[in-house]
């Protein structure tokens, strides 16, 4: 049969509220060298126990009896501390455990989860969470909106999750947890009602350097909209903004619109350029969420200036004309150049030169036409840019370089057939 237990004092019981500090104590009397006392909780050795061991000899000799006291300190009682506690010693080849003591938790309900502050769009459903536990159980919850209970009694209304179908004004929510020991009230969560996201952002009109956009405002509850904010960002090719991407790749151009009307003219844009735009509307409570980025594009415009550095020289019945691309913005893709030349008493001759920046003209009448002048204009798909000032044909002087060019015969008739999609701004000398 087993040896008699060396334990002369067993752990007591502790029951209290969270945060309580308490001590469990066991005492044993042993002969010879005192053993190390281990503590068990629910059969598991406590490896990081806050325990102290005191050993008092009862005689002069080491082999006499010793009183050993082990104290386990529980510093701030938590649910994880609850259970059955025992002391454990190894004496010789035998194992002894004390009688158990129990640690229990009992007090006001303790919140595991409380409602959090949040923003919601007006008239939009959302959920709030609240969770509390004892012991003692059961714990019944009572939700309050703006300090008004949402049920007749605790446990009768929604419990862990409160579904709110929508709000039209900023409101406060809290929850009360009730058990046999009393009531605990959660923090008060403020639910701020923001305007709904605007809808149907669309283009009303387009100009090369401006876009007119409009949108439909969302509901904003009892709070009128104060303004809407529109952002435009260049669509960086290859880095295009995805429809729902939250942040643009660069600093956006931001404009504010007074409302109503829910419309805005965005100016100072680059022509023939892709942009992404989005809009958010603001009330006294704050801004709505942004709409998704909408891809838009400014149309092409005509070149804003004439070709530069035009030179025209004449050698007998031939004229050599060359120029450089306009310095002014092209406002689109350069499709080519138009050239017009005219003598003093002759009709104007119009030519489409294409993208070349020089041409050799074969003049009629063996160069006898006097006071010949040349004008050049650049064009895009949107039409012609302004014509250059008339440049007189200078007589060619020996020593001047004159490259060999394909000769362009003057058309037999002065009329010129324009491609149907070009708009020709007629030029008069």
């Amino acid at each position: 049969q087993a040896e008699e237990s060396p334990f002369v004092g067993n752990p007591g019981n502790i029951t209290g509220a969270r945060g309580l500090t308490g001590t469990l104590r066991c005492q044993l009397q042993v002969q010879g060298e005192p053993p190390e006392v281990h503590w068990l909780r629910d059969g598991q050795i406590l490896e990081l126990a806050d325990s102290t061991q005191t050993q008092v000899p009862l005689g002069e000799d080491e082999q006499d009896d010793w009183i050993v006291v082990s104290q386990l300190r529980i510093t701030s009682l938590q649910l994880s501390d609850t259970g059955q506690y025992q002391c454990l010693v190894f004496l010789g080849h035998q194992t002894f455990v004390s009688q158990p003591g129990y640690v229990g938790l009992e007090g006001l309900p303790y919140f595991l989860e409380e409602p959090e502050d949040r923003t919601v769009a007006a008239n939009t459903p959302f959920n709030l969470s609240c969770q509390a536990q004892g012991p003692p159980e059961p714990v019944d919850l009572l939700w309050l909106q703006d300090a008004v209970p949402l049920a007749t009694a605790p446990g009768h209304g929604p419990q862990r999750s409160l579904h709110v179908p929508g709000l039209n004004k900023t409101s406060s929510f809290s929850c009360e947890a009730h058990n046999a020991k009393g009531v605990t009230t959660s923090r008060t969560a403020t639910i701020t009602v923001l305007p709904q996201q605007p809808r149907n952002l669309h283009l009303v009109s387009r100009q090369p350097t401006e876009l007119e956009v409009a949108w439909t405002p969302g509901l904003s509850g009892i709070y009128p909209l104060t303004h809407c904010t529109l952002q435009a960002v260049l669509s960086d090719d290859g880095m295009g903004i995805q429809a729902g991407e939250p942040d643009p790749p660069e600093e956006p151009l931001t404009s504010q619109a007074s409302v109503p009307p829910h419309q805005l003219r965005l100016g100072s844009l680059h022509p023939h350029t892709p942009y992404h735009i989005r809009v958010a509307c603001t009330s006294s409570q704050g801004p709505s969420s942004w709409t998704h980025w909408l891809p838009v594009e400014t149309p092409e415009g005509v070149p804003l200036g004439p070709p530069e550095n035009i030179s025209a020289t004449r050698n007998g019945s031939q004229a050599f004309v060359h120029w450089q691309e306009p310095r002014a913005p092209l406002q689109g893709t350069l499709l080519g150049y138009r050239l017009a030349y005219q003598g003093q008493d002759t009709p104007e001759v119009l030519m489409d030169i294409g993208l070349r920046q020089e041409v050799t003209l074969e003049l009629q009448g063996d160069g006898s036409v006097s006071n010949l002048t040349v004008c050049v204009a650049a064009y895009t798909a949107a039409g012609d840019g302004p014509w250059s000032l008339p440049v007189p044909l200078e007589a060619w002087r020996p020593g001047q370089a004159q490259p060999v060019h394909q000769l362009v015969k003057e058309p037999s008739t002065p009329a010129f057939s324009w491609p149907h999609h070009h708009h020709h701004h007629h030029h008069h000398h």
Partner: antibody
Framework: QVQLVQSGAEVKKPGASVKVSCKAS????????INWVKQAPGQGLEWIGW????????KYNEKFKGRVTLTVDTSISTAYMELSRLRSDDTAVYYC?????????WGQGTLVTVSS | EIVLTQSPDFQSVTPKEKVTITCSAS?????MYWYQQKPDQSPKLLIY???NLASGVPSRFSGSGSGTDYTLTINSLEAEDAATYYC?????????FGQGTKLEIK
């Protein structure tokens, strides 16, 4: 000396229940936890749960919760493990073991075979 | 749960050799326990609280380690040591065992 003696082998059909016993001697039965451990053929060891005979308190491995019930009869220093809704993968040797934060004494094991 | 991984799974050793079995825990633990199981027998406690020899266990067995890495050492192996060895933790619930190391004597 400490001894744990288990009941004999059992053959059961799928869906049935089995109850294995473990008789303790040589120590104060109500002071020490009794654990149950499963060992499937050619496999390792898997803890099922414990019971504290002094109070009847139990703790189960989540994997076995709902199908296993641990009980004791302190008057005859015997612990029991009942396993219900038996399946073919319940075929194993089941051990009872005394624990003091680890398993210091083991029963000889009971083979439970589940076969149709 | 804490997973214990033993190394090696199998070892064939000659008598008088020194054998080392390691056990690695998936997270830090305070104590390790070691068991020996011979064919058709129940497991037997060898080492408790990492380094303490259980009653009746020969002194050629020893245990050491801390944190996540623990070792069982058998100095001068004997024929009767042919068995499967298991490590075990109970630092957190549920208690778990290693997959076992089978030791064969050449």
């Amino acid at each position: 000396q400490v001894q744990l003696v288990q009941s004999g082998a059992e053959v059961k059909k799928p869906g049935a229940s089995v109850k294995v016993s473990c008789k303790a001697s040589g120590y104060p039965f109500t002071d020490f936890y009794i654990n149950w451990v499963k060992q499937a053929p050619g496999q390792g060891l898997e803890w099922i749960g414990w019971i504290y005979p002094g109070s009847g308190n139990t703790k189960y491995n989540e994997k076995f919760k709902g199908r296993v019930t641990l009980t004791v009869d302190t008057s005859i220093s015997t612990a029991y493990m009942e396993l219900s809704r038996l399946r073919s993968d319940d075929t194993a040797v089941y051990y009872c073991a005394r624990s003091t934060g680890f398993f210091d004494y083991w029963g000889q094991g009971t083979l439970v075979t589940v076969s149709s | 749960e804490i997973v214990l991984t033993q190394s090696p799974d199998f070892q064939s050793v000659t008598p008088k050799e020194k054998v080392t079995i390691t056990c690695s825990a998936s997270s830090s633990i305070g104590y390790m326990y070691w068991y020996q199981q011979k064919p058709d027998q129940s497991p037997k406690l060898l080492i408790y609280l990492t380094s303490n020899l259980a009653s009746g266990v020969p002194s050629r067995f020893s245990g050491s380690g801390s944190g996540t890495d623990y070792t069982l050492t058998i100095n001068s192996l004997e024929a009767e040591d042919a068995a499967t060895y298991y490590c075990q933790q109970w630092s957190s619930n549920p208690p778990t065992f290693g997959q076992g190391t089978k030791l064969e004597i050449k």
